[in-house]
């Protein structure tokens, strides 16, 4: 009998507001034996996929997923879904991505350190379970 | 079809260097992490050291044996993964396999180069 | 780091049985552990992976068990090509420790 896969979680690091030209990781998390982490953008058509996972608790692993200088035109919705054999899970909530001129001045506002969830999450569609994995045939139009 | 294929081995002096490679195919190299394992004759089995994908840095980790001798490095562009091995000792001789980590397991295992130590 | 207790060192069974395997984790480390079989002259080939998991083509008499710092594997009704060696490894934290093995003979 097949299990019932949990739902990822998203989250960025540092934050969810991340100054033009900086970094983000974005890190997904979902049980042991995940085979692949996807990190979708927008909609499912443009994704990246990894194998590197690792531990994050005994019962849980993660993958990262980094952008190393950020663009606006990388700002949007973000979500992790997983493949953990024979099946996808479901996909994530959504993790908004904000992309601000780097004044860094003192008025500028923080970024939200390790932020998953507030105003910026928003509730996947929860259309789930009919993705295919990357090497079946379905495109990855990478996201950065 | 997965293939790892090790070559470098071979035989060596006592605080000799070698470099081992592994030319990877098969599957999307640059989002798997790789892995250096060995095994001694008649012995069982040892990792050795793993490196991460580019997204993690290309962060490395290594044996308490071999910290501060091995050093792994790899080639996204050509799909290499290497194994610069330093001031080597006897007790190095082994059997040396590049193995593929997906999702936290070690799936998949080339089938080994030897090196031996000797003087 | 994390040690690995495996047991038994070796192990004698008869065609057709039914024979179990522990691993002993130092600490807890979930179900972050696999099981190996090889072949004299051949390389590792993972079996178990996550503690309870089947690997991709390898036949279900193979099980695995266990979380925690706890584990069994088992393998049923033993077949000629089962005689070999085993081996558990965590992959909980580097270094990626593995049990000493296990070799698994006829009887």
């Known amino acids: 009998q097949e299990e019932d896969l949990p739902r990822p979680s998203i989250s960025a690091e540092p934050g969810t507001v991340i100054p033009l030209g900086s970094h983000v990781t974005f890190v997904c998390r979902g049980p042991v034996g995940v085979q692949t982490f996807r990190l979708e953008r927008d909609s499912r058509s443009t994704y990246n996929d990894t194998e590197d996972v690792s531990q994050a608790s005994p019962s849980e692993s993660e993958a990262r997923f980094r952008i190393d200088s950020v663009r606006e035109g990388n700002a949007g919705l973000y979500r992790c879904i997983y493949y953990k054999p024979p099946k996808w899970s479901e996909q994530s909530d959504y993790l908004e991505l904000l992309v601000k001129e780097s004044s860094g001045g003192p008025d500028s506002p923080d970024t939200e350190p390790g932020s998953s969830a507030g105003p910026t999450q928003r509730p996947s569609d929860n259309s789930h379970n009919e993705h295919a994995p990357a090497s079946q045939g379905l495109k990855a139009e990478h996201l950065y | 079809e997965v293939q790892l294929v090790e070559s470098g081995g071979g035989l060596v002096q006592p605080k000799g260097s070698l470099k081992l490679s592994c030319a990877a195919s098969g599957f999307s190299f640059n989002t798997h992490a790789m892995n250096w394992v060995r095994q001694a004759p008649g012995k069982g089995l040892e990792w050795v050291a793993r490196?991460?994908?580019?997204?993690?840095?290309?962060?490395?980790y290594y044996a308490d044996s071999v910290k501060d001798r091995f050093i792994i490095s790899r080639d996204d562009s050509e799909n290499m993964v290497y194994l610069q091995m330093n001031n080597l000792k006897t007790e190095d001789t082994a059997i040396y396999y590049c193995?593929?980590?997906?999702?936290?397991?070690?799936?998949?295992w080339g089938q080994g180069t030897t090196l031996t130590v000797s003087s | 780091d994390i040690q690995m207790t495996q047991s038994p060192a070796s192990q004698s069974a008869s065609l057709g049985e039914s024979v179990t395997i522990t691993c002993l984790a130092s600490q807890t480390i979930g179900t972050w552990l696999a099981w190996y079989q090889q072949k004299p002259g051949r390389s590792p080939q993972l079996l178990i992976y996550?503690?309870?998991s089947l690997a991709d083509g390898v036949p279900s008499r193979f099980s695995g068990s266990g979380s925690g710092t706890k584990f069994s594997f088992k393998i049923n009704s033993l077949q000629a090509e089962d005689f070999v060696s085993y081996y558990c490894q965590q992959l909980y934290s580097t270094p990626f420790t593995f049990g000493s093995g296990t070799k698994l003979e006829i009887k």
């Open positions: 490196i991460r994908t580019k997204s993690n840095n290309y962060a490395t």
């Open positions: 996550a503690a309870t």
């Open positions: 193995v593929r980590l997906r999702g936290g397991f070690l799936d998949y």
